[in-house]
């Protein structure tokens, strides 16, 4: 089956700047600002655009060693990024893949809102553990806050 989950989290960073840092340059920035969450990101196939396959390696002690993600869409104008987790992590016997969409929209206060949509494609009649969803959301918020802190401390970056 397919299980849909959506979440929103606010940021004080303007949408365009956050998109550049968190999405367009996240592969370089995340291991730098959140090494406890992401060890490295490498392109296995492609140059970063749609169809690119990336391998994200997690630090020792993490529940998973790595995931492989496929870039599905990079919409630089509407600040939207779509990708699928196709291997590693929770993908395996019960889970076929996870399709994710991140959209960053401008907020009235000059900051932005990060909108995350996840589609879990399960095998057979397997269901998704609510605790797993909660953990994934907390992880995403943690990465966002790490990027946010970096941008607040480095006013020249990603302008």
């Amino acid at each position: 089956g397919v299980f849909n989950y959506e979440a929103e989290t606010p940021s004080v960073i303007p949408a365009a700047r956050l998109f550049k840092a968190f999405i367009l340059d996240g592969d370089k920035l995340l291991p730098k600002v959140a090494p406890e969450a992401v060890s490295s990101v490498e392109n296995i196939e492609g140059n970063g655009g749609p169809g690119t396959i990336k391998k994200i390696t997690f630090p020792e002690g993490s529940p998973f060693k790595y995931v492989k993600e496929r870039v599905d869409e990079v919409d630089r104008v509407n600040f939207k990024y779509s990708f699928s987790v196709i291997e590693g992590g929770a993908v395996g016997d019960a889970l076929e893949k996870v399709c994710n969409e991140i959209k960053i929209v401008a907020a009235p206060d000059g900051g932005s809102i990060l909108k995350i949509s996840n589609k879990f494609h399960t095998k057979g009649d397997h269901e998704i553990n609510a605790e797993q969803i909660k953990i994934e959301k907390e992880k995403a918020v943690g990465l966002l806050k790490a990027v946010e802190s970096y941008l607040l401390a480095h006013s020249d970056a990603y302008n």
Epitope: K28, D156, A157
Partner: antibody
Framework: QVQLVESGGGLVKPGGSLRLSCAAS????????MNWIRQAPGKGLEWISL????????YYSDSVKGRFTISRDNARKSLYLQVNSLRAEDTAVYYC??????????????????WGQGTTVTVSS | DIVMTQSPLSLPVTPGEPASISCRSS???????????LDWYLQKSGQSPQLLIY???NRASGVPDRFSGSGSGTDFTLKISRMEAEDVGVYYC?????????FGQGTKLEIK
């Protein structure tokens, strides 16, 4: 704030040389491609050169190829244009302008979104 | 080289009235990424050019919503829904699909 400031223009005789500079501030200069664009008195805009973020890729218009050299120093956050064998038709205001950013997912174009105030080059005997 | 042709070259407009400028390219500006590499710039008297519209139809940061860009392939239009005094200047279209980047001749927008 995000800013580009050109300098180095002046009055020079035909056949002479100048080195134009463009100082960047308020953004990570090393992430961006950069351009030089000029405007002759009372005329329109003319693109003359582009350099990639690392400096490894360089492009020129036919009108300046072989005479002008674009370069950059990312540590100094500066863009340069060495102009040699100057002619009367090179008289213009020279602008530097920011081009696409280059990030982990690739180079993404958002227009020439930051321009300097321009520096004037006058070629006259 | 890609040739950019603008029309009209001069456009007197009454304040509050709409204005429209056309730009035509000698070859398609549609990139394989799905975007048209066509920008619009405004140069006010004695100032540097400023970006209005990028990739055919996207307003640059801080640009009033009375400005809009449209078109695809070889034919593009810049529209101002209601002319204001501060909109006076020379408008240029520019293609960034390939080097050399090329500009249109410019359209001088003035108050009627």
């Amino acid at each position: 704030q995000v800013q580009l400031v050109e300098s180095g223009g002046g009055l020079v005789k035909p056949g002479g040389s100048l080195r134009l500079s463009c100082a960047a501030s308020g953004f990570t200069f090393s992430d961006y491609y950069m351009n030089w664009i000029r405007q002759a008195p009372g005329k329109g805009l003319e693109w003359i050169s582009l350099i990639s973020s690392s400096g490894s890729a360089i492009y020129y218009s036919d009108s300046v190829k072989g005479r002008f050299t674009i370069s950059r120093d990312n540590a100094r956050k500066s863009l340069y244009l060495q102009v040699n064998s100057l002619r009367a038709e090179d008289t213009a205001v020279y602008y530097c302008a920011r081009d696409r950013g280059e990030w982990a997912l690739g180079a993404y174009y958002y227009g020439l979104d930051v321009w300097g105030q321009g520096t004037t080059v006058t070629v006259s005997s | 080289d890609i040739v950019m042709t603008q029309s009209p070259l001069s456009l007197p407009v009454t304040p509050g009235e709409p204005a429209s400028i056309s730009c035509r390219s000698s070859q398609s500006l549609l990139h394989s990424d799905g975007y048209n590499y066509l920008d619009w710039y405004l140069q006010k008297s004695g100032q540097s050019p400023q970006l209005l519209i990028y990739l055919g139809s996207n307003r640059a940061s801080g640009v009033p919503d009375r400005f809009s860009g449209s078109g695809s392939g070889t034919d593009f239009t810049l529209k101002i829904s209601r002319m204001e005094a501060e909109d006076v200047g020379v408008y240029y279209c520019m293609q960034a699909l390939q080097t050399p980047y090329t500009f249109g001749q410019g359209t001088k927008l003035e108050i009627k």
